[in-house]
């Protein structure tokens, strides 16, 4: 069954520097990548970036950079100050469309334990079903 | 499918400048890489320069002192500034677009001739 795992991490740098960090653990060609914030695309998140692996890349503020990491996983340099700042509670999602798997989607955020710096374990995150 | 189309390619003196341009057809994504190849006759298509959306540059060494990349104010333009031509910078100058970074599809436009009289 394929899966989705998201890491969240804060900058100690920058406190209003957040990576996300999302792959898709899967057999399928991927033909789009969906990071929003707020809960999963769709249902009350806001897209950050789209990421296409043919067309290219689209990102919305506070993203600064929406990057492939490899075939599989992507990677997210969010910045923000006020409003438009992401804090250590946001939840950042990840929707991967696949083929011929269908369209998985995970979602997570930084652990309330963690200190700036350090990183969530990219761990699967719990998956949405998502066709 | 994303079209790549040159222009600014020409003769000129050896020490001229000249700058080309290439556009995209592709408006609403960001292509993550685009750059210059170049190939003179007989010889092995090379790298001259690329420049990610968020404009991190990579010019080759040979004309690192001589040539800049730019993206353009719109969308998925490219341009290369050449100065100070050298008769072995004549080639066919071609734009090159990497949506993802990752070489899983690669845009090739048609090419330009640059040629550098002495």
């Known amino acids: 069954t394929p899966e989705v795992w998201v890491q969240v991490r804060m900058e100690a740098t920058e406190l209003s520097s957040f990576t996300i960090r999302c792959g898709f653990l899967g057999s399928g060609s991927i033909s789009l990548v969906t990071v929003s914030w707020g809960g999963p695309n769709g249902a009350g998140g806001t897209t950050l970036a789209v990421l296409h692996p043919e067309r290219g890349i689209r990102q919305w503020a506070p993203a600064r950079q929406a990057r492939w990491e490899t075939q599989s996983s992507i990677s997210l340099i969010l910045e923000g100050s006020g409003a438009s700042s992401p804090c250590a509670n946001t939840t950042f999602c990840c929707k991967f469309a696949s083929f011929p798997e269908g369209s998985w989607e995970a979602c997570g955020s930084l652990p309330p334990s963690s200190d700036p710096g350090l990183s969530a374990p990219p761990t699967p995150a719990p998956i949405l079903r998502a066709d | 499918q994303v079209q790549l189309v040159e222009s600014g390619g020409g003769l000129v003196q050896a020490g001229g400048s000249l700058r080309l341009s290439c556009a995209a057809s592709e408006t609403y994504f960001d292509l993550y890489v685009m750059g210059w190849y170049r190939q003179a006759p007989g010889k092995d298509r090379e790298l001259v320069a690329t420049i990610t959306y968020t404009g991190s540059i990579k010019i080759v060494d040979s004309v690192k002192d001589r040539f800049t990349i730019s993206r353009g104010d719109a969308k998925n333009t490219v341009s290369l500034q050449m100065s100070s031509l050298k008769p072995e910078d004549t080639a066919v100058y071609f734009c090159?677009?990497?949506?993802?970074?990752?070489?899983?599809?690669?845009?090739w436009g048609q090419g330009t001739q640059v040629t550098v009289s002495s």
């Open positions: 090159n677009a990497d949506p993802s970074g990752l070489g899983r599809k690669v845009y």
